[in-house]
Amino acid sequence: KRFHDVLGNERPSAYMREHNQLNGWSSDENDWNEKLYPVWKRGDMRWKNSWKGGRVQAVLTSDSPALVGSNITFAVNLIFPRCQKEDANGNIVYEKNCRNEAGLSADPYVYNWTAWSEDSDGENGTGQSHHNVFPDGKPFPHHPGWRRWNFIYVFHTLGQYFQKLGRCSVRVSVNTANVTLGPQLMEVTVYRRHGRAYVPIAQVKDVYVVTDQIPVFVTMFQKNDRNSSDETFLKDLPIMFDVLIHDPSHFLNYSTINYKWSFGDNTGLFVSTNHTVNHTYVLNGTFSLNLTVKAAAPGPCPPPPPPPRPSKPTPSLATTLKSYDSNTPGPAGDNPLELSRIPDENCQINRYGHFQATITIVEGILEVNIIQMTDVLMPVPWPESSLIDFVVTCQGSIPTEVCTIISDPTCEITQNTVCSPVDVDEMCLLTVRRTFNGSGTYCVNLTLGDDTSLALTSTLISVPDRDPASPLRMANS
């Protein structure tokens, strides 16, 4: 059998196989050692017994989408049946005091691979026996702790495969310089040690995307905005736009990035090299926000100019593209071959990213201030509590609700929260009466809200002992 017979039905064309060469990966035309690594079809009854105590689930994720030329990282996490875990030696053990369907196990081990490998590798002392090999016959890498790595992961995409020895979670990085744009499929098959052979325990696949567009996300924040995720904001208060470029492998680390903004309110174009920008809308309504991001990224070098009289047609661009890996620090898997080499050429190509959003601008509460605090005199005998009136003004729209949060002087531990509806006139002047239990310093957060906005003011107040001579003090505003 060949790798492609074992690993999946996705058969890229001969052209794709030739041009999507992944550095350190091998062609799936290679032979697969079925004696050491048996192959079971889906639905084969043997899967049922491939793992003691149930089935192992493999979860495959990636940091896709990836800008072409950058590295994409894949991670596989194994989920063992209930009450099982991998220990520090790579053995699979039962968790203490954990009860599964079979009850508590007397044997601490599900798989004691340490004992197995000591028994089976005695032949030449190096552990380099005929069975410590991958499905294509390549020997396992023998760095010091390799015996504790008891799972064999075979990654397969674009007509190529990559083999990896690992534990219950592994990461592999691939350079995408030679990967066709668009969605691609990654498939992973996981085997476990079984004496002098291996047993398949899980198969998983996931779609990843390689794109020539810079993946761009924009977060928007505005003070007093009640719900930052509904794309409704307030008039006359600045909105902070923060651009995040999805570039986990830092491919664009040394690129100059330009941000071109159009806010849709006839204020023209705004060009910046800063990933954050503030903009204030002065009219209510709906506006179309557009952002274009431009970066000079490492990219393919153009073909050399054709000679004056070519005797045969020049090759197409696709066959002469050279790629190079950005020299920024990036993620790596567990094999030095996983990162592409850097050829002599160092070409740049402009890459673009786009973001568009429709935002709605409405009236809102812009500001709130406590202008006066009054200790409300209580009849004799003095009770333990104090009543205090806060006189509050606001600007902008008329609030419908007031909340006070009374907490300790650090403003961290909440002691009391009271919210109540309010009926305020156009002048936006209101009095809020609150009770304080005992003397001391309190942090008071006072918020005024309506449907779209929530404005806050804070103050520290010092409530005196119930002595008529002690004045109420605003400790800090």
Epitope: V59, T61, S62, D63, T73, F74, A75, N77, I79, K85, A88, H143, P144, G145, R148, R167, C168, S169, R171, S173, P248, P329, G330, P331, A332, G333, D334, N335, P336, E338, L339
Partner: antibody, heavy 116, light 108 residues
Framework: EVQLQQSGPELVKPGASVKISCKAS????????MNWVRQSHGKSLEWIGD????????TYNQKIKVKATLTVDKSSSTAYMELRSLTSEDSAVYYC?????????WGQGTTLTVSS | DIQMTQSPASLSASVGETVTITCRAS??????LVWYQQKQGKSPQLLVY???TLAEGVPSRFSGSGSGTQFSLKISSLQPEDFGSYYC??????????FGGGTKLEIK
């Protein structure tokens, strides 16, 4: 016994660079990713990045605007983190931590103060 | 990236009480969640891994539960040495492996 011994506190000026070390002992250095985590005063923990000591491949947290470079010296079982173009916002305690795949052993922390 | 939201941010309790800290992941992380304890001026220490397995030497009054996106750490019969900060962290999939905002547990 597994131990991660970090270098001592650093006081540097804004714009400068610093290199923090983390010497591992009591286990096979190349078997585990080494992570770096920072904690600003009174704040939560932030994952900066990790390095695979077997071949030096590193991954960084894109969200944190820390200009960090992670390296290892396998011969001395030591991991390094170099921080460049420092600002006062980089003042924090920096920890190294061994990953399997969670952080089971941590260094004692290196306090970095960036001040003019 | 996966966001971890921890609550409450702070909590005061008395010795002998039972407290629960919660952690929410922005997407399914299965059981790939850990809890750390950090005392003032010290490094964090592993408390619970795989959402519910106690690390070596951790007293049984600590217990972790949950899977998917909702997790909690329960400390029953609080002891004086339990006061400090607690952090959750995911270790699922590709980096970054983010932490929750932390919970400061103070003595009442």
């Amino acid at each position: 016994e597994v131990q991660l011994q970090q270098s001592g506190p650093e006081l540097v000026k804004p714009g400068a660079s610093v290199k923090i070390s983390c010497k591992a002992s009591g286990y096979t250095f190349t078997d585990y990713y080494m992570n770096w985590v920072r904690q600003s005063h009174g704040k939560s923990l932030e994952w900066i990045g990790d390095i695979n000591p077997y071949h030096g491949g590193s991954t960084y947290n894109q969200k944190i605007k820390v200009k960090a470079t992670l390296t290892v010296d396998k011969s001395s079982s030591t991991a390094y983190m170099e921080l460049r173009s420092l600002t006062s916002e980089d003042s924090a305690v920096y920890y190294c931590a061994r990953n399997w795949p969670y952080f089971d052993y941590w260094g004692q922390g290196t306090t970095l103060t960036v001040s003019s | 990236d996966i966001q971890m939201t921890q609550s409450p941010a702070s909590l005061s309790a008395s010795v002998g009480e039972t407290v629960t800290i919660t952690c929410r992941a922005s997407e399914n992380i299965y059981s790939f969640l850990v809890w750390y304890q950090q005392k003032q001026g010290k490094s964090p220490q592993l408390l619970v891994y795989n959402a519910k397995t106690l690390a070596e030497g951790v007293p049984s009054r600590f217990s972790g539960s949950g899977s998917g996106t909702q997790f909690s750490l329960k400390i029953s019969s609080l002891q004086p040495e339990d006061f400090g900060s607690y952090y959750c962290q995911h270790h699922f999939g590709t980096p970054p492996y983010t932490f929750g905002g932390g919970t400061k547990l103070e003595i009442k």
